[in-house]
């Protein structure tokens, strides 16, 4: 906190410039209106002030607003933006995009801060929906952003949005949030012709039940192993040898490296073992030969 | 983001020292660069600044006309040239900078003895 002095003669601001840099804290709190830093906030982020000096700009600026900042402030803090306590934050309205973009930037390259979080946070919700210009921005900030998100929070991304997400942007996401992006993405891409529609439905297949896997694999997909690897496991169990062999195309060699490992290795132990037979791999594990397999229910009806 | 300064050292008064600042990992030459120094006890005060097009120069009434700030963006560098030094100039010299979207860097300092 500066003590509240009066400003020498002379030193009183009439603009944010360089020569401000010369001043001491005292001398920044004394000689600069508040209310002409509001409407010069720009001039700051060219001026090479020492965190101490934005100390007290930032103190300004808190006693002009005690309620919050004006957008037309908030969109040209640059830096002071690292300066803010998500309790500041909250206090804001915060509803063009370029804003968001603006105070992305600041950040840019680190981690997602307190800051930042709180700051989407109260974006998305004024704006009720994750729409498609939102997302297209945060994940272009943050890949991992759509991953971060509840299944919950998730179900409020309209399908039109899907169409900003990249492959990347989905890969930290568990099988409870591509349950809810998969339906979406299905129905964002669904007046997409095969290929097309498979390169673009490929990285939500985490979320796809088995009758989407068995259609696919009639349309000559050619899925690769590490896609494969992903699916539910649910999903893979009750797809045939033949089902597999043509929904991974070329790719089917990959089994044999997998076959230790989910979904692979159940999958396994539900096929025939003559059907894995016919696929030339090698795998093992599977229902040997003459054995009956019965479903519980259909032995119930028979006794 | 490290700015890194060098050139300090002990020197007699009315010799000469010639400060660099320089990034580490990324590039300045499009940062204002401030100058600053902080003697012992004292609050960290201005020295000089300059655009980041080397355009627009300022300095503290204290070091106008002996301390001179020049960048050469080829060698990503800003320099302080400091003359005529007095025992008051002795401080520890840091240089900051201001970048696109506000963007701040900040370096550790190098120390001057005028002695």
């Known amino acids: 906190e500066v003590e509240k002095t009066a400003c020498p003669s002379g030193k009183k601001a009439r603009e944010i410039d360089e020569s401000l840099i010369f001043y001491k804290k005292w001398e920044l709190e004394a000689c600069v209106d508040a209310a002409l830093l509001a409407t010069q906030m720009d001039r700051v982020n060219a001026i090479p002030f020492t965190y101490e000096q934005l100390d007290v700009l930032k103190h300004k600026l808190d006693e002009l607003y005690p309620q919050g900042y004006p957008e037309s402030v908030i969109q040209h803090l640059g830096y002071l933006f690292l300066k803010m306590s998500p309790e500041d934050i909250r206090k804001w309205n915060v509803t063009s995009l370029e804003t968001l973009k603006a105070l992305l930037e600041v950040n840019k390259g680190h981690e997602m801060s307190p800051q930042v979080a709180t700051l989407i946070d109260r974006f998305v919700k004024g704006r009720g929906q994750l729409d498609k210009d939102t997302l297209d921005t945060l994940t272009a900030f943050y890949p991992g952003y759509l991953c971060s998100l509840s299944p919950e929070e998730l179900s409020s991304v309209p399908p039109s949005s899907i169409w900003a997400v990249r492959p990347q942007d989905l890969d930290t996401c568990d099988p409870r949030q591509l349950d809810v992006l998969y339906p979406k993405a299905r129905l964002a891409f669904q007046n997409m012709n095969g290929s097309e529609y498979f390169v673009k439905i490929q990285s939500f297949l985490g979320g796809a039940p088995t009758e989407d896997l068995k259609a696919l694999s009639q349309q000559n997909v050619s899925m690769d192993l590490a896609t494969f690897m992903k699916l539910r496991t649910d999903a893979v169990l009750p797809l045939t040898v033949a089902e597999v062999q043509k929904l991974l195309g070329p790719h089917v060699e990959g089994l044999k490296a997998e076959e230790r490992h989910r979904p692979v290795r159940d999958w396994i132990l539900r096929q025939r073992q003559d059907d894995l037979d016919t696929l030339g791999l090698g795998l093992q594990g599977g229902i040997p030969n003459g054995y009956l397999v019965l479903d519980l229910s259909m032995q119930e009806a028979l006794s | 983001l490290q700015l890194v300064e060098s050139g300090g050292g002990l020197v007699q008064p009315g010799g000469s020292l010639r400060l660099s600042c320089a990034a580490s990992?990324?590039?300045?030459?499009?940062?204002?660069i401030g100058w600053f120094r902080q003697a012992p006890g004292k609050e960290r005060e201005g020295v000089s600044s300059?655009?980041?097009?080397?355009?627009?120069?300022n300095y503290a009434d204290s070091v106008k006309g002996r301390f001179t700030v020049s960048r050469d963006n080829a060698k990503h560098t800003v320099y302080l040239q400091m003359n005529s030094l007095k025992p008051e100039d002795t401080a520890v010299y840091y240089c900051?900078?201001?970048?696109?979207?506000?963007?701040?860097?900040m370096g550790q300092g190098t120390s001057v003895t005028v002695s």
């Open positions: 900051e900078g201001v970048g696109d979207y506000g963007r701040r860097a």
């Open positions: 990992g990324f590039t300045l030459d499009n940062y204002a």
């Open positions: 300059i655009s980041s097009s080397g355009g627009s120069t």
